[in-house]
Interface confidence: medium
């Protein structure tokens, strides 16, 4: 049991101690006390290093002292001849004597008392990291303001963890900076910025002083940065050893500062800021970004507008612009959206023409329309070249999406007529000489094709049959041949309003305005045997002069028979109107003097009996175009005559061009518009 004091006497004290003795005493005082051991009497055989006899004072394995010889007190007021003060609560006293003593030695008398020790000052190593407070039997540690005492009750640390920095810019320093940082501390700081910002840390070299690494390069005190799965550090030493700017690529950063028990370094100070996460600037030749910037960062919004001819396709629609946002992950929203060339699709086909298969149907691609030559040509004189425009339409040189129109070439026979100059008396013709020739079977008559939907004929041909059946493309009108030719069906008949309708048509003496138009149900396909004749122009070039030659053709009466089954034709000169007047009219049902002659009539024929006759009515009197010798125009229509084989009268078509065009325009077929 520990005691507060005690006495230790050598064997037989105060008598002489015996030889060959070894005795030890264990002194123990309570915890928190030291021991004051003092000798009041000492008489032991003297030897070098007290080798023979001795009293030894041990503190554990450490020898506090070894005594021999005689001692007396130097202080008249104190009996103490030798003393020991130890800050420990245990001591061992060992007495040894050898086998012989030359004299009689009385040994020693010693006493011990428990003494208070000042733990705060009595040890080389201070027991407290900061403030030490001694009391009798013990001590306690305390800390400066803002420090706290660790669980070991000796070490003070700073409460430097738990701080969360959310501002986009800030400064963080080690505790007490620039004064020395605390020992035995672990400081944790958290930077938590809004998504879309990366933490960038800046440390100046001179703002960093942390206890250097040991000989093996391990930091005793360290500063570490942790961002997600990345770690920067540990850093220590004088002057910051890491990069001056640490770009973390993260919006969250943990800063850990770990210190050990020693050191007088000043610590560190850093600055951080949130850099908006950058999004790549994509240079694209197909779009424009607004606003244009050198760098785009989080939350930047751009309007991406496709250049002319480019679009964004989604589902079944196209858009020319969209917004994109730089997102928190450094990527653009809508990054799948790309401006692609507008696709015009396969060009539409056209009637009586064809379109080249373009190599591509994308913006800028070119295609060409052509008409089926030589029977059709392109109206409006276009070259047929179209390109894929930015609005997704194929457009022509005038930037119009209107498709080219292939219209029939008029007035050009595939083979020129070279026959005799008569129908009466007969000269066979081929339909290729007169591809405009139309055959009416009821009444037996003729007509002239002037357009794919229109036939021009004499009014008296259709006045009795408002639904005539017509044929084109055949030289012969034999039933078996007609079956193979193209039959035309009328949609509507337009008789000139100036044509007077009679109850007894056979008694007609007035053939003024003997002109009519037949609109067809379906368009006529042109070819070598079917082609329209041109209409006369309105200029004076188309005013006929006496002697001008024209061609007539038909399946009408000849010298030999009432009707011809094969096409006949003749070339006739224009004659003065009086020549027609002078011929006696052969019509028992009408008064010869009552016949009307008007400027709407052309007189032609009179030479060698060449003339048109019954059954030729409505056919064209075709004259070479004064402005294009390769073409024929319909100058007249076979109308009436005083006598077959003399002179004939033809409706002067030039006087009706306005009516013809107006009627055709006002009644155009909807599918053609």
């Amino acid at each position: 049991e520990p005691t507060m004091y005690g006495e230790i006497l050598s064997p037989n004290y105060p008598q002489a101690y015996p030889s060959e003795v070894e005795k030890s005493w264990d002194i123990e005082v309570p915890e928190g006390y030291g021991i004051h051991l003092y000798f009041t009497h000492l008489d032991i055989e003297l030897s070098e290093n007290c080798a023979y006899d001795s009293v030894q004072i041990m503190s554990g394995d450490i020898e506090e002292g070894r005594l021999c010889g005689q001692r007396t007190s130097n202080n008249p007021h104190s009996p103490i001849v030798e003393e020991f003060q130890v800050p420990y609560n245990k001591l061992q006293v060992i007495f040894k004597s050898d086998f012989s003593n030359e004299e009689r030695f009385t040994g020693f008398a010693a006493y011990y008392v428990a003494t208070d020790i000042n733990e705060c000052t009595d040890f080389v190593d201070a027991p407290c990291s900061h403030f030490c407070n001694n009391f009798i039997g013990g001590y306690f540690c305390s800390c400066p303001p803002e420090y706290f005492l660790h669980d070991d009750m000796k070490n003070c640390g700073v409460n430097c963890s738990g701080d969360v920095f959310t501002a986009l810019i800030g400064e963080i320093a080690s505790p007490n900076y620039p004064k020395p940082y605390p020992e035995n501390s672990r400081c944790e700081y958290q930077i938590r910025l809004e998504k879309g910002f990366q933490v960038v840390v800046t440390v100046r070299r001179e703002d960093f002083d942390v206890e250097p690494a040991d000989s093996e390069g391990n930091c005793l005190d360290s500063l570490v940065f942790v961002a997600g799965d990345q770690q920067f550090g540990p850093y220590c030493g004088r002057g910051f050893p890491g990069p001056l700017n640490i770009e973390t690529k993260s919006n969250a950063l943990d800063i850990i500062f770990q210190t050990d028990l020693t050191g007088q370094n000043k610590g560190w100070k850093l600055r951080y800021h949130g850099d908006p996460m950058p999004c790549p600037k994509e240079e694209t030749p197909t779009s424009v970004w607004e606003p244009a910037k050198a760098k785009y960062v989080f939350r930047d919004v751009v309007r991406i507008t496709c250049l002319d001819g480019f679009e964004v396709v989604e589902g079944r629609v196209g858009a020319t612009s969209f917004h994109s946002t730089c997102q928190s992950n450094g990527k653009w929203s809508n990054s799948k959206l790309k401006c692609q060339p507008v696709d015009c699709g396969i060009p539409e086909s056209i009637e009586n023409g064809k379109v080249e298969d373009p190599e591509s149907t994308l913006f800028g691609s070119v295609t060409r329309y052509t008409c089926e030559e030589p029977y059709y040509y392109m109206e409006n004189g276009g070259n047929g070249q179209y390109h894929c425009a930015s609005n997704g339409s194929w457009v022509n040189e005038a930037l119009s999406p209107e498709l080219p129109k292939c219209v029939p070439v008029c007035g050009v026979p595939r083979e020129p007529f070279e026959g005799k100059q008569r129908i009466i008396g007969g000269s066979d013709a081929d339909i290729k000489n007169f591809p405009w020739q139309v055959f009416f079977d009821n009444p037996w008559a003729g007509g002239a094709l002037i357009d794919e939907y229109w036939v021009l004929t004499a009014a008296h041909v259709v006045e009795g049959n408002q639904e005539p059946t017509m044929y084109v493309g055949s030289t012969s009108v034999q039933t078996s041949r007609l079956a193979k030719s193209k039959m035309l069906t009328s949609e509507r008949v337009f008789i000139h309003p100036g044509w007077k309708l009679l109850e007894v048509p056979e008694a007609r003496t007035n053939f003024d305005n003997d002109i009519a138009l037949v609109q067809l149900k379906d368009p006529v396909k042109m070819g070598p045997t079917v082609a329209p004749i041109c209409l006369p122009g309105t200029s004076s070039d188309y005013n006929l002069m006496d002697g001008d030659l024209g061609l007539i053709a038909g399946w009408g009466r000849t010298e030999k028979r009432d009707r011809a089954l094969r096409l006949k034709a003749a070339r006739l000169p224009v004659a003065p109107l009086r020549k027609c007047r002078e011929v006696k009219v052969e019509n028992p049902k009408a008064d010869a003097g009552a016949y009307v002659f008007t400027p709407n009539m052309i007189c032609a024929g009179g030479e060698k009996g060449m003339d048109s006759c019954k059954g030729d009515s409505g056919g064209a009197f075709a004259v070479q175009d004064p402005n294009d010798k390769a073409k024929f125009y319909v100058a007249g229509l076979v109308s009436w005559g005083p006598q077959c084989g003399t002179y004939g009268l033809y409706t002067r078509v030039q006087n009706y061009v306005d009516w013809i065009k107006k009627t055709m325009q006002e009644n155009s077929t909807p599918s053609k518009d």
Epitope: V301, R303, V312, E314, G315, R316, A319, F322, H323, T325, Q327, N329, K331, S333, N334, S335, K336, L337
Partner: antibody, heavy 116, light 107 residues
Framework: EVQLQQSGAELVRPGALVKLSCKAS????????MHWVKQRPEQGLEWIGW????????IYDPKFQGKASITADTSSNTAYLQLSSLTSEDTAVYYC?????????WGQGTLVTVSA | DIVMTQSHKFMSTSVGDRVSFTCKAS??????VDWYQQKPGQSPKLLIY???YRYTGVPDRFTGTGSGTDFTFTISSVQAEDLAVYFC?????????FGGGTKLEIK
């Protein structure tokens, strides 16, 4: 013709996980974003997130982070949604949808019922 | 997150009437708003994209207007088959968010 065919209805226990599929036809999923949208009974639509099948990038609504995982298999032209730690709150119809600029095409929906 | 608010949960109308739905964004979303129709038991169907563009095949009685934060979707002459829930959605930035929906009921 563009189509998104979703897998059939699922009845699952609380705490389990489920993986839904969305098979695309008529287009290549690599050229689009594939989205997943949640609709609880008689409620509105909630966007869960998207995947860019071309590179596997995903973006989630933060409230589904940790709950939902979107993946895609470009070889089978299919997108997937995996839901973990299921609770009754996860009972809903889940739609997949395709977009570049807007959700032009949707799957027919998959009903997930979480019940003990 | 951007919140899309459709103030009316229900709207009641008669066939032939004109009806308008509103949708308000909690911040500027430019014109990045789409409108969807969802009929009972069906998937949503896109009607209007980018605030005012009618998607292909959508009848012209459906129109959309607005930009910034206020958006309107209108059916000019309601038909019986328009009975559905109508949702707005912003795709301005992620997370993409939907409005709560407005249910159109036919009287």
């Amino acid at each position: 013709e563009v189509q998104l065919q979703q897998s059939g209805a699922e009845l699952v226990r609380p705490g389990a996980l489920v993986k839904l599929s969305c098979k695309a036809s008529g287009f290549n999923i690599k050229e689009y974003y594939m989205h997943w949208v949640k609709q609880r009974p008689e409620q509105g639509l909630e966007w869960i997130g998207w995947i860019d099948p071309e590179n596997g990038d995903t973006i989630y609504d933060p409230k589904f982070q940790g709950k939902a995982s979107i993946t895609a298999d470009t070889s089978s032209n299919t997108a997937y949604l995996q839901l973990s730690s299921l609770t009754s709150e996860d009972t809903a119809v889940y739609y997949c949808a395709r977009s570049r600029l807007f959700f032009a095409y949707w799957g027919q929906g998959t009903l997930v019922t979480v019940s003990a | 997150d951007i919140v899309m608010t459709q103030s009316h949960k229900f709207m009641s109308t008669s066939v032939g009437d004109r009806v308008s739905f509103t949708c308000k964004a909690s911040q500027d979303v430019r014109t990045a708003v789409d409108w969807y129709q969802q009929k009972p038991g069906q998937s949503p169907k896109l009607l209007i994209y980018s605030a005012s563009y009618r998607y292909t095949g959508v009848p012209d009685r459906f129109t959309g207007t607005g930009s910034g934060t206020d958006f309107t979707f209108t059916i000019s002459s309601v038909q019986a088959e328009d009975l559905a829930v109508y949702f707005c959605q912003q795709q301005y930035t992620t997370p993409y968010t939907f409005g709560g929906g407005t249910k159109l009921e036919i009287k």
